[in-house]
């Protein structure tokens, strides 16, 4: 016997669709090696129509896959628009031939049944309404009308025209007629469940002169739709209820064995499990809603139903959709860290991964909001100014080509731990999650700026230096100006020679900034921070304020404000000074990626790291934790 | 209350032919597969057939002992389904019971573990004579 397994018989009809799925045993050698689906000829040969390593033949051409789910040792070959030539008998198997381990698979296809002349078929999905149409003569016109339910050995009424109504029906059943037309009467049933599935008679009159008409009701659980995401992207159940339901409140749920529990709704209900990585966007007037989830695990598998109901629970004769998610760990979006850990006054260099094929695409970070619906307003973009309560703390660096850009945010709160989405206006499974955690800071910071009190004088030289401790000494030490369109970073040069690497004086590591002269133009923020290659690390804020030569003048002293921007990481010991006029930014990027257009985005997410130390459990220290100011003199 | 109810067992001759019926039943209960296993004595309950069903497509699996002697249908309504036994031995002698899925995961989970179906009957005995 083969140790392969799947289904022996497979029986659909034209135009609809199959999944077949094959199981293998559990070996490295068979979760890697090849599979494939062929068609058994006459003479014995398997001809190959779909394998694993990219083949795909002429005839299955736009309307075949296969997946391998090695964590389940499985593989599916999914085929659409099926015809009757698709008849036959096939294998599904491994290995690098046709000869290989497998399994044979019969495949019958057959045409859309032909039905009775004499019955009418109602087809309706669970929770719709249908309206039967009986027609009559018009000499029953006066002659009572009904709809009755055939069951075993009679008919059981659901409605008649004398208004009695099974109580099963009460509430969901009419019997009307439209306008002047005598000749037809029609029946309205609303919520249809299971149950109602079957056989029901109108009539009109009794007798042998009675008008009668057979009708067969079908009422079909919605087919599940087939969703394959990577771990670690996103999905976006697009949920389309109808505009009898536009006023009810939505809710998206996972069945499991015996219900179906609420995963978010419009309500304000949202589980636990999916806290920071799920948001509900209503659409529009007609029942429309969606529900995006990012950070995709192994165990967001499984069945999901998006239905609408007053209670945002799910109810029996409601109406529904329904998705079968699979969950595919052998993903290419890259494991980063979903937790990224900083303390007050520190900072936290976030990587967040995109599309490499996509670098000129539009990165922005949003944090995510969880009341109401939840959403996600942005809160910085290469083409999105920051937003005005993060002046001078947060900056996005994007290092084209290399598939990662940087988020850093400085001068943190315990207000800023969250979630954060990084996202960009290209392929939308990358969109990525990562959880701030702020601890209270309890040792001093990694970088210091002196003097603290930073107040330079119009047309004099002012010089700040940035204190870093010897592990930093072999990154990289920058200093940017930062303005709302990110932190441009300032040309540096050595400030002689280096120390020997091998002894490293704790009070001599600086790097400094020299202004000179000082201009009107030079206030503003100013990041001292290390890097290593592409790769961010620690950073500490300073404002500098520019005032006139003014005899005995007194100014707001901004201590507080750069006490507070402290961060940390290791990096190279350079002395150097900057000398700098035009501190120009980065191009202005242009619109703003508004809270909406992030809301409605479609598809996928997760976990990041922040760079180097920002985040290690050694990493950082900070000072106050207060929010700052900006300073004006 | 989802209740698998068997009916069918009894005493056959070898070679001779059974046929076994699971009915469910439950308010609101439509399945989306339903299978038979066995246990006989002093051994672990093991697969015998499952059928699958997504709108107008059906998939039937068959364990290896009984392949090209049992084979599983359902009714159109697909709340019953049907356990077909030809040229039964006496190693078929067990008790067999219905198992159903509401819950259509079995794309992704191997219908031959028990572990993974949600409800059970409580079983109709099977006896084959020599």
């Known amino acids: 016997k083969s140790p392969i397994f799947g289904p022996q018989e497979v029986s659909s009809i034209e135009g609809d669709s199959v999944s077949i799925t094959c199981y293998y045993p559990d070996t490295s050698v068979n979760r890697h090696t090849r599979k494939y689906w062929c068609r058994q000829g006459a003479s014995g040969m398997c001809t190959t129509l779909i394998s694993s390593n990219g083949y795909l033949s002429k005839e299955y051409s736009g309307r075949a896959n296969l997946i391998n789910f090695p964590e389940n040792n499985t593989f599916v070959i999914n085929i659409e628009q099926l015809t009757q030539d698709d008849t036959g008998s096939y294998k599904c198997g491994l290995g690098t031939s046709n000869r290989g381990l497998s399994f044979d698979v019969s495949l019958e296809v057959s045409q859309v049944p032909e039905l009775p002349s004499d019955t009418h078929v109602y087809t309706k999905d669970i929770g719709r309404n249908v309206t039967i149409e009986c027609p009559f003569k018009r000499e029953n016109a006066p002659s009572k009308k009904s709809l009755c339910k055939k069951t075993n050995q009679s008919c059981e009424l659901v409605i008649d025209s004398t208004e009695k109504v099974n109580p099963s029906y009460i509430g969901r059943a009419k019997l009307f007629m439209k306008g002047t037309d005598l000749t037809v009467f029609y029946v309205n049933i609303s919520h249809l469940t299971h149950n109602d599935a079957g056989l029901y008679i109108c009539q009109a009159g009794e007798g042998p002169s009675a008008d009668k008409k057979n009708v067969d009701l079908q009422v079909l659980a919605p087919e599940p739709e087939l969703l394959y995401k990577d771990l670690r992207s996103s999905v976006t159940f697009e949920c389309d209820l109808g505009r009898e339901v536009a006023n009810e409140a939505k809710y998206l749920c996972r069945m499991n064995k015996e219900t179906c529990d609420v995963i978010i709704n419009t309500l304000g209900k949202r589980d636990p499990d999916f806290e920071g990585r799920i948001l509900i966007t209503p659409k529009d007037d007609n029942g429309r809603f969606s529900v995006l989830i990012t950070g995709l695990r192994k165990e967001d598998a499984g069945h999901y139903q998006c239905g609408a109901h007053s209670s945002g629970l799910p109810q029996e004769g409601w109406p529904i959709q329904t998705w079968q998610l699979f969950v595919n760990e052998e993903s290419t979006i890259p494991n980063r860290r979903s937790v990224v850990k900083g303390v007050t006054g520190g900072s936290v260099a976030i990587a967040c991964p995109y599309n490499p094929k996509e670098s000129s695409s539009l990165k922005y970070w949003c944090r995510w909001e969880g009341d109401g619906n939840g959403h996600c307003p942005v809160l910085v973009g290469t083409q999105a100014q920051v937003q005005e309560e993060y002046e001078g703390r947060l900056a996005l660096f994007d290092q084209p080509g290399n598939g990662t850009y940087t988020v850093i945010l400085n001068q943190l709160t315990t207000e800023d731990a969250g979630f954060y989405w990084c996202l960009t206006n290209g392929d939308s499974r990358w969109r990525t999650t990562i959880e701030l955690q702020v601890a209270e800071a309890t040792r001093e910071p990694n970088l210091e700026v002196t003097p603290q009190n930073a107040t330079a004088v119009l047309g004099e030289t002012f010089t700040v230096s940035c204190h870093y401790p010897c592990k930093f000494y072999s990154q990289e030490k920058y200093w940017c100006k930062w303005s709302n369109k990110g932190c441009h970073i300032l040309p540096s040069h050595d400030e002689g020679a280096r120390q020997s690497s091998v002894s490293c004086d704790q009070s001599s590591q600086l790097v400094s900034m020299t202004l000179n002269p000082v201009s009107k133009e030079d206030e503003g923020w100013y990041w001292c921070g290390v890097k290593q290659g592409q790769t961010y690390g620690e950073t500490t804020a300073i404002y500098i304020a520019v005032e006139e030569r003014t005899r005995g003048s007194s100014h707001v002293n901004p201590t507080d404000a750069n006490a507070r921007a402290k961060v940390a990481l290791e990096e190279e010991v350079v002395d150097s000074s900057i000398s700098e006029k035009e501190n120009k930014a980065i191009p202005n990027p242009g619109p703003f990626a508004n809270e909406r257009e992030i809301q409605n985005v479609g598809d996928q997410a997760q976990e990041n790291r922040a760079s180097g130390d920002a985040g290690s459990a050694d990493g950082q220290s900070r000072s106050s934790s207060s929010k700052h100011h900006h300073h004006h003199h | 209350e989802v209740q698998l109810v068997e009916s069918g067992g009894g005493l056959v001759q070898t070679g001779g032919s059974l046929r076994l019926s699971c009915a469910a039943s439950?308010?609101?209960?439509?399945?989306?597969?339903m299978g038979w296993f066995r246990q006989a004595p002093g051994k672990e309950r093991e697969f015998v057939a499952a059928?699958?069903?997504?709108?107008?497509?059906?998939?039937?699996y068959v364990g290896d002992s009984v392949q090209g002697r049992f084979t599983i249908s359902r009714d159109a309504a697909g709340n019953t389904v049907y356990l077909q036994m030809n040229s039964v031995k006496p190693e078929d002698t067990a008790v067999y019971y219905c198992?159903?899925?509401?819950?259509?995961?079995?794309?992704?989970?191997?219908?031959?573990?028990?572990?993974?179906?949600?409800?059970w009957g409580k079983g109709t005995l099977v006896t084959v004579s020599s």
């Open positions: 198992a159903a899925d509401r819950v259509p995961k079995d794309i992704s989970i191997d219908p031959r573990n028990p572990k993974d179906w949600d409800y």
């Open positions: 059928i699958r069903w997504s709108g107008a497509t059906t998939y039937k």
């Open positions: 439950g308010r609101t209960f439509s399945p989306y597969a």
